[in-house]
């Protein structure tokens, strides 16, 4: 793993509100050179958020993750906390980003060993959570609305940085062996697909309970199925922003070297997700223009439907 200079490549000016530790898989500090200290939290869906290390919930979360890491290591796995340099596992693909966050990938950073190829499900369902698509908008027209944002501050404040791209399309989790993370949880996503015993035509996936404590974060081997983007419905609740890539092949070859700088534009901060079933299939987007948060949603089969008052809105129609 390349540990380059300590130049600050993530700037956090807005910190996230509480996230349950149950849904966190990894944390690390930003670089000392960033000035303002922050903890970068990674969620189970590989979204990154800035958090204030002085907040009690952040301290508790880090302590919990440390214990989990220790337990996993005892079980023969590895789990990285990685204090210091902040790097995506693969690429800072056009995932969500807050207007208060600036991510500057190093031009000489390692390139991803994986190229994202989301399915049509991903395209239609979730600009909100697809690693390859901006988080600023999300599909609508279904019956399941986003949950109410936290009331005390008018909803969670956004700090999402970027997501880690999907790895493969099927998963079978064996019940006998511990689900080991990769050699480095914060390195290239050279994760091997879990051995599948399912006929792909059945569209089935299997999960068995392994032995390690709480299935301690098996994040080195997160496997995405069928171009999944599991939670589009809340992707807007933290004022996430769609990045504006500095090059034109917006979905191709998202290696760190391909993005000289990332800036953001604000978009609507609430939305309702697509709840319509979508046919699975292969879809490899090759956009010819940069992806802006204000892009025409029809191009990707979504409809932007802001919910001005999520507290009052019912979650189902």
């Amino acid at each position: 793993q390349h540990h380059g200079v300590t130049k600050c490549n993530i700037t956090c000016s807005k910190m996230t509100s509480k996230i349950p530790v149950a849904l966190l898989i990894h944390y690390q500090q930003n670089q000392a050179s960033c000035g303002k200290r922050a903890i970068i939290l990674e969620t189970r869906q590989h979204r990154l958020f800035c958090a204030d290390p002085k907040e009690q919930w952040v301290k508790d979360a880090m302590q919990h993750l440390d214990r989990q890491a220790a337990a996993l290591t005892r079980n023969g796995g590895t789990f990285e906390k990685q204090i210091g340099e902040v790097k995506p596992r693969t690429t800072p693909a056009a995932g969500g980003m807050d207007e208060s966050v600036v991510l500057e990938p190093e031009a000489t950073g390692e390139s991803s060993s994986l190229e994202p190829t989301p399915s049509s499900q991903e395209a239609q369902r979730a600009l909100g959570t697809s690693p390859e698509l901006p988080t600023g908008v999300t599909g609508s027209s279904g019956t399941r609305l986003p949950p109410t944002p936290k009331a005390q501050d008018g909803g969670p404040v956004g700090t999402e940085l970027f997501r880690v791209p999907p790895v493969s399309t099927a998963a079978t989790w064996q019940s006998s062996a511990p689900h080991q993370p990769g050699p480095s949880l914060w390195a290239e996503a050279k994760t091997s697909e879990a051995p599948s015993t399912q006929d792909p035509s059945t569209q089935a996936s299997t999960a068995s309970s392994p032995a390690p404590e709480e299935n301690a974060p098996s994040e080195g081997q997160r496997v995405w199925g069928q171009g999944q983007s599991p939670r589009p419905e809340n992707s807007l609740e933290r004022e996430e922003m769609g990045p504006v890539p500095a090059h034109t092949d917006a979905f191709q070859d998202w290696g760190p070297g391909s993005m000289a700088h990332v800036s953001v534009v604000p978009v609507s901060s609430e939305g309702t997700p697509s709840r319509e079933p979508v046919a699975s299939g292969s879809w490899t987007p090759k956009a010819e223009e940069p992806i802006h948060a204000t892009m025409d949603p029809q191009r990707l089969g979504v409809l932007i439907t802001p919910v001005p008052d999520a507290q009052a809105a019912t979650r189902r129609q």
Epitope: R44, A170, S205, V223, W224, Q228, P230, R231
Partner: antibody, heavy 122, light 107 residues
Framework: EVQLVQSGAEVKKPGATVKISCKAS????????IHWVQQAPGKGLEWMGW????????KFNERFKGRVTITADKSTNTAYMELSSLRSEDTAVYYC???????????????WGQGTTLTVSS | DIQMTQSPSSLSASVGDRVTITCRAS??????LAWYQQKPGKAPKLLLY???TLAEGVPSRFSGSGSGTDYTLTISSLQPEDFATYYC?????????FGGGTKLEIK
């Protein structure tokens, strides 16, 4: 309307395996985590594990480790929970439930199946 | 694991009464708490979640309070349909755990 419909009651012998189904409708099946919750007679609720159909590795309650398998058939929007090496204390009602929240909010369970009663008896 | 201790385990009250059920966590759960109502032979029903947010369709007579490790569910004026068993659930950390339940009976 979101609905989770579970399979019917089961009677099994100790040592056997049971497979309970949970058919989802009214939402995009692959977008939401499915959880399984056990409720033994006269007892409280116990979370067994989560899984998102066809995707991330599951997470299980340590108490059920090695005995639970969760599968999902996306063509029929059905999740399955298989419990092996059954013993009498597995006699319970088993619920599937979904958590509607993004990972920034957490897993509370807003939709539940009607429950499947499992009786383990020799 | 975080243990959830609910009290009382049973409670008798009359229609119109104000009742309070408490839930204590063995560690900080940072307000990631949900309350459920369960009637015999039925699945639990979500009442409140994170930061005491009322779930969809739940009457406003139900409210929650608390922080840190101590939380309370209050029913301001009991209605006949409120007689049921109530459970709290923490979802700060896995394994998610529920309280032992409070059975609310008609006096």
């Amino acid at each position: 309307e979101v609905q989770l419909v579970q399979s019917g009651a089961e009677v099994k012998k100790p040592g056997a395996t049971v497979k309970i189904s949970c058919k989802a409708s009214g939402y995009t099946f692959t977008n939401y985590y499915i959880h399984w919750v056990q409720q033994a007679p006269g007892k409280g609720l116990e979370w067994m594990g989560w899984f998102i159909p066809g995707s991330d590795p599951p997470k299980f309650n340590e108490r059920f480790k090695g005995r639970v398998t969760i599968t999902a058939d996306k063509s029929t929007n059905t999740a399955y929970m298989e419990l092996s090496s059954l013993r009498s204390e597995d006699t319970a009602v088993y619920y599937c439930a979904t958590s509607p929240t993004d990972e920034t909010q957490g897993d509370y369970f807003d939709y539940w199946g009607q429950g499947t009663t499992l009786t383990v008896s020799s | 694991d975080i243990q959830m201790t609910q009290s009382p385990s049973s409670l008798s009250a009359s229609v119109g009464d104000r009742v309070t059920i408490t839930c204590r966590a063995s560690g900080r759960i940072h307000d990631f708490l949900a309350w459920y109502q369960q009637k015999p032979g039925k699945a639990p029903k979500l009442l409140l979640y994170t930061d005491n947010t009322l779930a969809e369709g739940v009457p406003s007579r139900f409210s929650g309070s608390g922080s840190g490790t101590d939380y309370t569910l209050t029913i301001s004026s009991l209605q006949p349909e409120d007689f049921a068993t109530y459970y709290c659930q923490q979802f700060w950390s896995t394994p998610y755990t529920f309280g032992g339940g409070t059975k609310l009976e008609i006096k």
